[in-house]
């Protein structure tokens, strides 16, 4: 969480941003909140990006003002106009690109004063893994697949019964480039699986960590997966 204060002659206002990550090819949110004002027409929101000459987005006098918008953001940004009055300056970003990564500044002017806060935005690809029993294999085998990751992640297997065991010798992981030539499909196979055990396939890069669990018993198979973004810090 990053909290910034204004430094002008007028009073400073508190602006709060949260570091976040964008999944390339999908939409992203750059979060920013501020002390609200009672009049929408008195609020100015400017989003800037370090190293970019034009603005990312500007909202003032109750409407978007994009005459100074940088070309890389045209047609791709929007504020939540109906939420500005309650102090939400968050920015929606369409079709996140790798090049959208960087340091952004959320700069706010209201009748109470000015304030700004920076936001670190990481971009990459991350997806939920699915673990299945591979019935085509000669021995009991698990197959963990996740369709989109970037940068290349690490894959680690773990088991509830053999806690702390190193499965690197009995697993094989491959990375297959997807058609857009950036993200990769992750496939990891674990051999010599025993029943009545829960196995976890953990995929991690510097942006996200995802886990796919599978519980194999004689009577049933249970699956669960979850994904967590790393380094979501407020400012």
């Amino acid at each position: 969480l990053i909290i910034g204060f204004g430094i002008s002659g007028r009073h400073s206002i508190t602006v709060t941003t949260v570091a976040s990550a964008g999944n390339i090819g999908e939409d992203g949110i750059l979060s920013c909140t501020f002390e609200p004002d009672i009049k929408l027409s008195d609020i100015v929101i400017q989003w800037l990006k370090e190293g970019v000459i034009g603005l990312v987005h500007e909202f003032k006098e109750g409407k978007d003002e994009l005459s100074e918008q940088d070309e890389m953001f045209r047609g791709r940004t929007a504020v939540f106009a109906d939420q500005v009055i309650v102090g939400n300056a968050s920015l929606r970003l369409k079709n996140v690109q790798l090049t959208d990564a960087g340091t952004y500044k959320c700069y706010i002017i209201t009748s109470k004063g000015k304030g700004n806060a920076n936001l670190e935005y990481k971009t990459g690809a991350f997806s939920m893994p699915e673990v299945n029993v591979d019935y085509n294999a000669s021995s009991e085998t698990l197959r963990c697949e996740a369709p989109r990751w970037f940068p290349q992640p690490t894959v680690v297997w773990a088991s509830q019964v053999d806690q702390g065991a190193n499965f690197s010798e009995v697993s094989n992981t491959s990375f297959e480039l997807n058609s857009e030539n950036v993200t990769m499909k992750v496939v990891s196979v674990l051999y010599n699986v025993t029943i009545n055990n829960t196995y976890s396939c953990m995929i991690e890069n510097d942006i996200a960590k995802a886990t796919g669990d599978i519980k194999v018993t004689e009577s049933e198979i249970k699956r669960r997966s979850h994904l967590q973004l790393l380094n979501s810090k407020a400012s």
């Epitope: 409407k63 003002e65 994009l66 005459s67 929007a78 079709n95």
Partner: antibody, heavy 119, light 107 residues
Framework: QIQLQESGPGLVQPSQSLSITCTVS????????VQWVRQSPGKGLEWLGV???????DYNAAFISRLSISKDNSKSQVFFKMNSLQADDTAIYYC?????????????WGQGTLVTVSS | NIVMTQSPKSMSMSVGERVTLSCKAS??????VSWYQQKPEQSPKLLIY???NRYTGVPDRFTGSGSATDFTLTISSVQAEDLADYHC?????????FGSGTKLEIK
């Protein structure tokens, strides 16, 4: 109330150029981009290009060599010019505005101007 | 270019029937698909944007669904005034592209 209105020549000689003006009201050209779309008789819609709030443009690659879009913010007018017209450029030409500053649907359309390319 | 394929090309339905129109994208377009209704001699009108968001003033019998490559426009109970061409379009990537349309006729 958001409105867009095209005005064009109606008839264009083959190999000549086409100029259409789109006059907008109810919104500012410094806030929204304006898209251009055409519809040939009995055919589907074809996106031609867009001029953004800051004046930069994006064109359909199939028309990039003969299309230019410009605007005058103070007059709330967008200018569309296409060169070297042929018979298969006969179509209704529309200007349109997106639903928001993110392109996710053309919410407001002009009435269209029918352009016939014939000698 | 992303190709948007609509089916069927045309259909004839009775008032009150449920209508399902399909639109398939040749590549993933997220949810950046919109649906337009175009009545004879009129400009297209936006019905659905973002794959499933009904535009202001559009009757709730019109519903959009889908993501990635497969999209559907459903009219829950077709009315006589729904006689029109229906177009889908993607605005995920340049050039923005449209399907060739579905003509809906009322019996």
């Amino acid at each position: 109330q958001i409105q867009l209105q095209e005005s064009g020549p109606g008839l264009v000689q083959p190999s000549q150029s086409l100029s259409i003006t789109c006059t907008v009201s109810g919104f500012s050209l410094t806030s929204y981009g304006v898209q251009w779309v055409r519809q040939s008789p009995g055919k589907g819609l074809e996106w031609l290009g867009v001029i953004w709030s800051g004046g930069s443009t994006d064109y359909n690659a199939a028309f990039i060599s003969r299309l230019s879009i410009s605007k005058d913010n103070s007059k709330s007018q967008v200018f569309f010019k296409m060169n070297s017209l042929q018979a298969d450029d006969t179509a209704i030409y529309y200007c349109a505005r997106d639903i928001s500053t993110i392109v996710e649907g053309f919410a407001h359309w002009g009435q269209g101007t029918l352009v016939t390319v014939s000698s | 270019n992303i190709v948007m394929t609509q089916s069927p090309k045309s259909m004839s339905m009775s008032v009150g029937e449920r209508v399902t129109l399909s639109c398939k994208a040749s590549e993933k377009v997220g949810t950046y698909v919109s649906w337009y209704q175009q009545k004879p001699e009129q400009s297209p009108k936006l019905l659905i944007y973002g794959a499933s968001n009904r535009y202001t003033g559009v009757p709730d019998r019109f519903t959009g669904s889908g993501s990635a490559t497969d999209f559907t426009l459903t009219i829950s109970s077709v009315q006589a005034e729904d006689l029109a061409d229906y177009h889908c379009g993607q605005s995920y990537r340049y050039p923005f592209t449209f399907g060739s349309g579905t003509k809906l006729e009322i019996k």
